[in-house]
Amino acid sequence: QNASRGRRQRRMHPNVSQGCQGGCATCSDYNGCLSCKPRLFFVLERIGMKQIGVCLSSCPSGYYGTRYPDINKCTKCKVDCDTCFNKNFCTKCKSGFYLHLGKCLDSCPEGLEANNHTMECVSIVHCEASEWSPWSPCMKKGKTCGFKRGTETRVRDILQHPSAKGNLCPPTSETRTCIVQRKKCSKGERGKKGRERKRKKLNKEERKETSSSSDSKGLESSIETPDQQENKERQQQQKRRARDKQQKSVSVSTVH
């Protein structure tokens, strides 16, 4: 198209010059470049009411270059495309459009979401989490001893963070109450404050015990809640202390 226009212009204008500027092989005062030096691309630039031929080493933004036997021509990309390989494959869309499969869309198809950074339609990515870790040891204030109700925790990792429209991530840690393993705390695990608290609590429980003589030896459920387990432990402790008291008839002041 441009080459044939160039040929027509040459017939119309006898003042076709061979001493042209900026990569032109032939040119005219009125139309600028009519043909280009080897490997340069011909493009028509609109200046006011007229079109001027220009020869460039590469095509401007919004155009792509095609090499024909008679002309290397810059062709316009599609109207919504800023950079393209050819008419079928846009590589960068104009502002407000999203790139998808080489085409520019004003909104992304279902199942895809707009990435406003790359201006592309991308697959929706849902959160992916790993399996839960095993439950941690049952602990109370960082200790794994002392017949107390504690907590145990398990965690999981986020393997894939979600994209904007993806499903949110689930919690990454879970805590539940448990009974601390029944064992005495070694000296290193007991602090002064801890001993005083235990002494006060023990005296309180002994006072309670004198007014209550319940002996729970009935059938118990095979599955117990942490509360039930703790109550059972406390009752057993109270019975043991009552027997010891009767034997020694001395007030117990320390926990062994």
Partner: antibody
């Protein structure tokens, strides 16, 4: 969806003529340069001819110049290849394709056999 | 005309292997090179343009490289669906020319 459907192939004697057609749909036919590419049995691909989007310029490989004519009817979204003075070496599957530097979309092909 | 020399003409590889197909141009074609895949009984399909730009939907195990006159197509982790003939094509100059093709088979 882009579709290119070739027709008009067949068995023909050397020196005779054949006209291939390619019906296009799923894209703006008048925006695209179109080409014919052929493939001889068990051989490679060979570009035959190209016509630019508006039909104003045509290009041919040397071996078919003066014998083959590529044309188009944009109103009908149809591409043609008029093949005259056929030779045995023209035996091939002929594909019509969009030609925009690369051959992006291809038809299913039509077989042309030139034999006496 | 620019001659495109493709090698090997055929090759046999096992699933999971990496294969490389070479294409040499008789003169500098810059980065104006494409690769096509043609599965048995089908039309060719554009895989790669501008040496290394993958067409949308082409698996990332396909990659192209090179410049000037020496180019290659690499297929990592070969799959059964990759059994096909592969052709290079230059579009730097008319007539656009293709390599003779490489037929890829499974061992």
């Amino acid at each position: 969806e882009v579709q290119l459907v070739e027709s008009g192939g067949g068995l023909v004697q050397p020196g005779r003529s054949l006209k291939l057609s390619c019906a296009a749909s799923g894209f703006t036919f008048s925006d695209y340069d179109m080409a014919w590419v052929r493939q001889a049995p068990k051989k490679g691909l060979e570009w035959v001819a190209t016509i630019i989007y508006d039909g104003s310029r045509t290009y041919y490989r040397d071996s078919v110049k003066g014998r083959f004519t590529i044309s188009r009817a944009n109103a009908k979204s149809t591409l043609y290849l008029q093949m005259d003075s056929l030779r045995s070496e023209d035996t091939a599957t002929y594909y019509c394709a969009t030609h925009d530097k690369t051959f992006d979309y291809w038809g299913q092909g039509v077989m042309v056999t030139v034999s006496s | 005309d620019i001659q495109m020399t493709q090698s090997p003409a055929s090759l046999s590889a096992s699933l999971g292997e990496t294969v490389t197909i070479e294409c040499r141009a008789s003169e500098d074609i810059y980065s104006d090179l494409a690769w096509y895949q043609q599965k048995p009984g089908n039309s060719p399909q554009l895989l790669i343009y501008d040496v290394n730009s993958l067409i949308h939907g082409v698996p990332s195990r396909f990659s192209g490289s090179g410049s000037g006159t020496q180019f290659s197509l690499k297929i990592n982790n070969l799959q059964s669906e990759d059994v096909a003939s592969y052709f290079c094509q230059q579009y730097d100059n008319y007539p656009n020319t293709f390599g003779a093709g490489t037929k890829l088979e499974l061992k």
